[in-house]
């Protein structure tokens, strides 16, 4: 929380690839790869829908919502078996992210 990000220095990330598959109606599948230079005790994650360095504890325990991965105003819920998380928009639309 509040760790410095900017240029690709310690504690920072940049998006390397972003692939979108919109072939299925009403559904878009996106695969994103980021490159992060994280400090000791941190690991690449997602904060406010952007790549970031987060505490390794969050990844180890699969408490994905602790990264604050969703945008402000959305609700975060863990998927069953903690394979990822969902972000629920105020209108009810749900965005699901799985971790691989």
């Amino acid at each position: 929380q509040f760790l410095k990000e900017g240029q690709l220095a310690a504690g920072t990330c940049e998006i390397v690839t972003l692939d979108r598959d919109s072939s299925q109606p009403r559904r878009t599948i996106a695969r994103q790869t980021a490159r992060c230079a994280c400090r000791k005790g941190q690991i690449a994650g997602t904060t406010r829908n952007k790549p970031s360095c987060v505490d390794a504890r969050i990844i180890k325990t699969k408490q994905w919502c602790d990264m604050l991965p969703c945008l402000e105003g959305e609700g975060c819920d863990l998927l069953i078996n903690r394979s990822g998380w969902t972000c629920t928009q105020p209108g009810g639309r749900i965005k699901t992210t799985t971790v691989s």
Epitope: Q1, G41, A56, C65, C70, G73, E74, C76
Partner: antibody, heavy 113, light 110 residues
Amino acid sequence: QSLEESGGRLVTPGTPLTLTCTASGFSLSTYYMSWVRQAPGKGLEWIGIVYPSGTTYYANWAKGRFTISTASTTVDLMITSPTTEDTATYFCARGDSFGYGLWGPGTLVTVSS
Amino acid sequence: ELVLTQSPSVQVNLGQTVSLTCTADTLSRSYASWYQQKPGQAPVLLIYRDTSRPSGVPDRFSGSSSGNTATLTISGAQAGDEADYYCATSDGSGSNYQYVFGGGTQLTVT
């Protein structure tokens, strides 16, 4: 969107006290929640934080003296064994990676025999 | 443990520019935030991530950071700017996470 603290009152030393922060208009699942206190005429003092999962961290001086817990729309702060030095206004604050942008008005705790 | 040091009090003439500093005793790896607090009120976030302003905060308030010192600059000080100003930053991560406030600076506008 707002926060409101409640539960502040006059207590005698050693009597446990629980303060409650009630959140309105947003989900606690997408923010960090912290408790901060301010003794009369003094500066701000961070007590601790709770993450969406319920994981908590405390200031080194606060460990063992305070317990933070959370429910769907509330965050509690228990002062386990108050002393006169715990007399202060207690604030809850909503945070994310941009800092603490939303604060409650505070609730006053007075510890006196 | 990280300690943030601020001058206890600073005076500025109406309409002048004033800079408030916050010095960390060790080089902080984290962003600084600044909060304004008026008597009897809750703190208000003025600056986050060293230099960014939340919406609604006048552009008279600006932040900068160099080395282990963060600076809040108020241009064209107004009577309503009279308040206490606190800097803050996080320290550590994982099981050692801490959030630290400076001692605060009382700004008087004359």
